[in-house]
Amino acid sequence: YNNFRKSMDSIGKKQYQVQHGSCSYTFLLPEMDNCRSSSSPYVSNAVQRDAPLEYDDSVQRLQVLENIMENNTQWLMKLENYIQDNMKKEMVEIQQNAVQNQTAVMIEIGTNLLNQTAEQTRKLTDVEAQVLNQTTRLELQLLEHSLSTNKLEKQILDQTSEINKLQDKNSFLEKKVLAMEDKHIIQLQSIKEEKDQLQVLVSKQNSIIEELEKKIVTATVNNSVLQKQQHDLMETVNNLLTMMSTSNSAKDPTVAKEEQISFRDCAEVFKSGHTTNGIYTLTFPNSTEEIKAYCDMEAGGGGWTIIQRREDGSVDFQRTWKEYKVGFGNPSGEYWLGNEFVSQLTNQQRYVLKIHLKDWEGNEAYSLYEHFYLSSEELNYRIHLKGLTGTAGKISSISQPGNDFSTKDGDNDKCICKCSQMLTGGWWFDACGPSNLNGMYYPQRQNTNKFNGIKWYYWKGSGYSLKATTMMIRPADF
């Protein structure tokens, strides 16, 4: 019983030898080439690798496994036949030779054979399971490939339709561009014609400008002569006035006393009995500093201090901050009285501002503000206005609330540009706002479509340059 040995013979067949008493039994079992050798035991529950095998490799392995199964099946059949043959022979021998107690040994041998068969069967089952597992995985992979292919096909179809749409859109745009090009060519031709016309016009204007420049030179010379004459006349008049006041004071001391009174504004001059239009000397409030101003003693009851006048373009209004501060020009003609004096005056008591305008067609209009004052220089002579009435527009052409004063060298406007440089002249520019009475003076027939002219938007629009303007102030209680 216990003398049971297992060994390998020279040709690689498994050999089972059983020694029992004087009898010895040897079984030779065939070992299949493709079966796993006993030296590397097969582990049926080994973990499958996660990474999918290459499709061709999987197919190849499947074929190998199929071959193994086929071989195993053949081997089993051979084994069965072999066992049956051996059993028959052994049974005959046993029946012929064996004694009764030999039966147990035969049973043991049979059991061993059955165990061997069971082991081979289990191995086959494991192989079968692996093959099935691999087949299932391959089927899943194939399914995934199929789905992926369908998805790609759908994407290709979508992209194709998108391309078609884009091509349609492109052709539509091409047509549009062509149409625009045609239109552009026509416009270019039109512009070229206009350019040619403009060039003719420019050359005409150049010749006119040359003539005007010659006239200006002549006029400047004449003007210098006239100014000298005017200066001489003024001196003579002043001498006469001095002589008169001297003779008057000798006759009547009370008159002399009255002549020495200083006037703050034209309203005081008017109230003192001087009711004739003209230039008067005014004194700064709380100071002895004097300034010459033109007084309108006739319009609207008189007593108006003229703070600005434009009438003929004889004075350049593109001046510095300092010039606008102290004043410039000629009080009998075009001039600016001075921001400092007006600021001090209008902060002493309440003043009204009247702006009188004339166009080139003989029309006149005005804007009257019932309260007007200028802030100090520290606050850039900001303008403050209230209560508009008049015929030059229902909306104030001086932007509300008031803006700071700006000049070519003092940019205090609300524009990223420099309004004073762009539109010329010092003014209470917004950005740049609906008015500028200190703009460039343009003569008749050249006064339209000018962005830098003398402008009062709510009367004549943005491009109309006015013929004449007057800004005048008077105490509100006059």
Partner: nanobody
């Protein structure tokens, strides 16, 4: 942002009438002068009419004087052009435009236009 939208154009027989409207938004309509300008097919832009900010002053091109009337309703932010006794030569795209403060009599904003066709 400033927007001007014209409406009221269409096909009309010679001698007929049309009223164009221009709805303004994005700015203080009552503070600006407004204009009507037209462009006949294949021709340049031609000024038609203008109105001041409060509607008290109007002006017209000689070709439309006595036939066209410009008006405005500041409460409704709308500009109008009443066109009577229309002629074939009035066929054009009509634009409303705003005159800016510092535009030198030019227009700083335009509408997209409305087509008026006078034909029998």
């Amino acid at each position: 942002q400033v927007q001007l939208v014209e409406s009221g154009g269409g096909l009309v027989q010679p001698g007929g009438s049309l009223r164009l409207s221009c709805a303004a938004s994005g700015y203080t309509f009552a503070a600006y002068w407004m204009h009507w300008v037209r462009q006949a097919p294949g021709k340049g832009l031609v000024w038609v009419s203008r109105i001041n900010s409060d509607g008290s002053s109007t002006s017209y091109a000689d070709s439309v004087k006595g036939r066209f009337t410009i008006s405005r309703d500041n409460a409704k932010n709308t500009l109008y052009l009443q066109m009577n006794s229309l002629r074939a030569e009035d066929t054009a795209v009509y634009y409303c435009a705003r005159e800016g403060y510092s535009s030198g009599g030019q227009f700083d904003y335009w509408g997209q236009g409305t087509l008026v066709t006078v034909s029998s």
